[in-house]
């Protein structure tokens, strides 16, 4: 065993090349210089090492860089990245988007692993905010990335990053997340005109407050029912029948099919039946004529 720690004569590696795949684990340990490995990391990915051999190479790098690998090494880790633990990655300082892309490429097609989640976390924290280029990259690899962030994390997203978001990136976002993202989208898209603006903001409207929906209703936007059904119930309830009619335009007829579902059901309960009848859709459940409507939320605010 003791003899095996010494590198056999003539086996010392002068460079990282394909000949190393024939080395036993102990030979790699004994014959590959860690500094050489670090400078030639870009070659490792092209060589079909076994997982056991990759373990040895990782061990050598760990010994050389106990405080964490430098970015020059990280950028060329390739498949060796899959051997890293979240604890290893927490020691890194990754600042280059190219490095991030290279490592995400290794994991492409797989679910987001704890390693990748840690890497992204380190990268974003290092940058201080989730800028547009980063978000572009992350959503390209993981369309659901944005919706995996907490509302607190989303708060650091600058409005300019919202331009990188595609409608499908928001598919799994819940109302709390859209609450945070919608105002940022409103800021980001505010210099666009009416029709262009609505196309861009539509996916984010699940976070829109009542006042914004009222304003949109004046813009002839013709919101589709699928979008309307994703609106916050508390934002829809104060809308009048006339405002909902303007907001939906020709799609208003779709309310009938959704009258038993939120937010339509709750909205109907808040409207005067007379007003609902003006739509001619046969919507039932409104407040009968002659009844007094008390706005309890207003009363609570006053008390």
């Amino acid at each position: 065993e003791v003899e095996k720690t010494a590198c056999p004569s003539g086996k010392k590696a002068r460079e990282i090349d394909e000949s190393l795949i024939f080395y036993k684990k102990w030979e790699l340990e004994a014959c590959v210089d860690a500094a050489l490995l670090a400078t030639q990391m870009d070659r490792v990915n092209a060589i079909p090492f076994t997982y056991e051999q990759l373990d040895v190479l990782k061990h050598k790098l760990d010994e050389l860089y106990p405080q964490g690998y430098p970015e020059s090494v990280i950028q060329h880790l390739g498949y060796l990245f899959l051997k890293m633990s979240p604890e290893d990655i927490r020691k890194w300082n990754v600042t280059s988007l190219e490095t991030l892309k290279a490592l995400l490429e290794v994991n492409k097609g797989h679910e987001m692993s704890p390693q990748v989640a840690t890497l992204i976390d380190r990268f974003v924290k290092g940058r201080g905010q989730l800028d547009k280029d980063t978000l572009d990259t992350l959503t390209a690899f993981y369309p659901g990335y944005l919706c995996s962030l907490s509302p607190e994390e989303l708060s650091s997203v600058p409005p300019s990053s919202i331009w990188a978001v595609r409608p499908q990136d928001l598919d799994t976002c819940d109302p709390r997340q859209l609450d945070v993202l919608y105002p940022k989208a409103r800021l980001a898209f505010q210099n666009m005109n009416g029709s262009e603006y609505f196309v861009k903001i539509q996916s984010f409207l699940g976070g829109a407050p009542t006042e914004d929906l009222k304003a949109l209703s004046q813009q002839n936007v013709s919101m589709d029912l699928a979008t309307f059904m994703k609106l916050r119930t508390d934002a829809v309830l104060p809308l009048t029948v006339a405002e909902v009619q303007k907001l939906l335009g020709p799609h208003v007829e779709g309310l009938k099919a959704e009258e038993r579902h939120r937010p339509v059901r709750d909205w109907i309960l808040r409207q005067r039946q007379d007003d609902l009848d003006t739509l001619g859709l046969g919507l039932q459940g409104g407040i009968p004529n002659g009844y007094l409507v008390l706005d309890l939320s207003m009363q609570e605010a006053l008390s």
Partner: antibody, heavy 122, light 106 residues
Amino acid sequence: EVQLVQSGAEVKKPGASVKVSCKASGDTFNRYYVQWVRQAPGQGLEWMGIINPSGVSTTYAQKFQGRVTMTRDTSTSTVYMELSSLRSEDTAVYYCAESRVPGYNIFAMDVWGQGTLVTVSS
Amino acid sequence: SYELTQPPSVSVSPGQTASITCSGDKLGDKYASWYQQKPGQSPVLVIYQDNRRPSGIPERFSGSNSGNTATLTISGTQAMDEADYYCQAWDSDTYVFGTGTKVTVL
């Protein structure tokens, strides 16, 4: 008539923090976005950030990122702006302002507080 | 960073027209707002979304925006219009205010 009433003048030492409040009277305040703008003596206006009606979403100007925190207490219709690690250059009048003008995408500020003078001096 | 440049001062006789310009790269692609501020007072919004007037603002205030320049026009200027005026627009991740123009009514 809608009014935004801000807290009184403050004198702070360098390195300290200041928290300015902005309270609405006369209408349902929690329906609107609130922004903060400051003005150093004899200087122009400088935008600091914005907070949404529910208080869960904030966007800060890059210059103040990491030093400013805007919060909202919907139960008391009050918005707060806290600025930390104060330096002499932060001496200014701090204004809160609301976006109430009808508009689907703009954030023009049409209701303003009276301003709060914050003096940073050792 | 984005900059909006205004002339430091504009003088106008009562009843005449005052024009205040605000220049910025491709400013016409953004919406401009204008604020009036009198000494010791909070700013007042006079124009938003290039040319819209909030309720309570006199008709003599109007705005336009195209190319690289937004313009605030005060027709039939009155003594009460003497104040500082600031333009404002959104760029990337922040609202930018212009350098400010002092309007003096002679």
